[in-house]
Amino acid sequence: GQNITARIGEPLVLSCKGAPKKPPQQLEWKLNTGRTEAWKVLSPQGGPWDSVARILPNGSLLLPATGIVDEGTFRCRATNRRGKEVKSNYRVRVYQIPGKPEIVDPASELTASVPNKVGTCVSEGSYPAGTLSWHLDGKLLIPDGKETLVKEETRRHPETGLFTLRSELTVIPTQGGTHPTFSCSFSLGLPRRRPLNTAPIQLRVREPGPPEGIQLLVEPEGGIVAPGGTVTLTCAISAQPPPQVHWIKDGAPLPLAPSPVLLLPEVGHEDEGTYSCVATHPSHGPQESPPVSIRVTETGDEGPAEGSVGESGLGTLA
């Protein structure tokens, strides 16, 4: 059999080998496609099927506008002038080239050493679905699940049967100062069909910026707490990626796992002292916060003149 590829909406003519070019002809066309459940023999006199598959006077079969439902097998059996039976067999596949793919929501710049969403490549109106590929500086990008991540989605239009493809690219650039060019291409995977390419996008890769400042927040405000109360210290840093945070009390490192939050539950006088946090950024070294003082007091120097200080550290009038 012969493989035929036809563009959706375009006419297709299949010739019936051996058939005399003019009547009288002894021939039979039958098809097994998305429009049939089994083999359908077409009437030589024509009929309701003529809108999708019509036998021409020369014995060929005309499909005036091929559609997805016309994919399948077409067979002709003809008797030639010498009385010999000749068979033709065609396997028909259809295709539709989508619009030019586009990169939507592109990044404005990338940051080294952290995951960055480059953008989403979108292709609309293909058949069969086809594939989207990303390219970096003209070379095919192979997703490795670590430095290069691709999230794909394929949707099919309920009426037209055509596909929309989306591909989201996330990368972790290794170093700053570079200007990589990203592009995306759509391929139907058909012979002699060149891929469709998006316009390339060139992005600047910057080094992760130094922390713009390091703040130590304390709760309760002022750092004065009643015995048995809870103190929460939060090290706030605006840096990417988030650095490792260690804690210092009275000049000595605390033996705790790195964390931006230090929780002191059920405080006693032994928890009193001066606290600070140290943020260690991979490319900028350590940076220490201004210190805060924690005091544990029964009534609280700044508490109300009469009454008591509850566990929350808020004064309650008697």
Partner: antibody, heavy 119, light 107 residues
Amino acid sequence: EVQLVESGGGLVQPGGSLRLSCAASGFTFNNYWMTWVRQAPGKGLEWVASIDNSGDNTYYPDSVKDRFTISRDNAKNSLYLQMNSLRAEDTAVYYCARGGDITTGLDYWGQGTLVTVSS
Amino acid sequence: DIQMTQSPSSLSASVGDRVTITCRASQDVGFYVNWFQQKPGKAPRRLIYRATNLADGVPSRFSGSRSGTDFTLTISSLQPEDFATYYCLEFDEHPLTFGGGTKVEIK
């Protein structure tokens, strides 16, 4: 809204001729096959003629072949049925319907026009 | 030519009844069958297309099914406005052939 309006029916003598028209609106006329169906008084439905969307190909049952001619004018969104050599058994309400091929079947129908063949 | 044998030719039923009408094709017509409803003095109205698909605006109590060359129109719960004549049509081959019709009357 799809609308089909037939006209041209009436009383005609056996052997006479009549031309029915169908004015179509509310859809892209030249995208569809069109069909005439008739219904004799108190009887069932009978297919009379079909035409493809371009007007190049026409189809008839043996009962009217060589007597009736279906045609269309896509510029005017109009369908026609020329009926010659009319017989008493052609007496019926004639309906214009959209479709007639396997993609549509028959989906929308006009209200019909009565043709009476009698002396 | 294909014959579409429709049965019964008439039936009496009450509001709320389940009604089944059958058309048998004399040869394979695939799923190329429509069902129509016709009321006296009116044009036919398509109910079902391609054997099993409900046409736009048709109540869901109507349904179509197919088993080989047997096609069935079912009205799950007959309503007063459903008393009419019903026809099947095959549009797989010429001549296009209608069933003889089924008149659904009030019991």
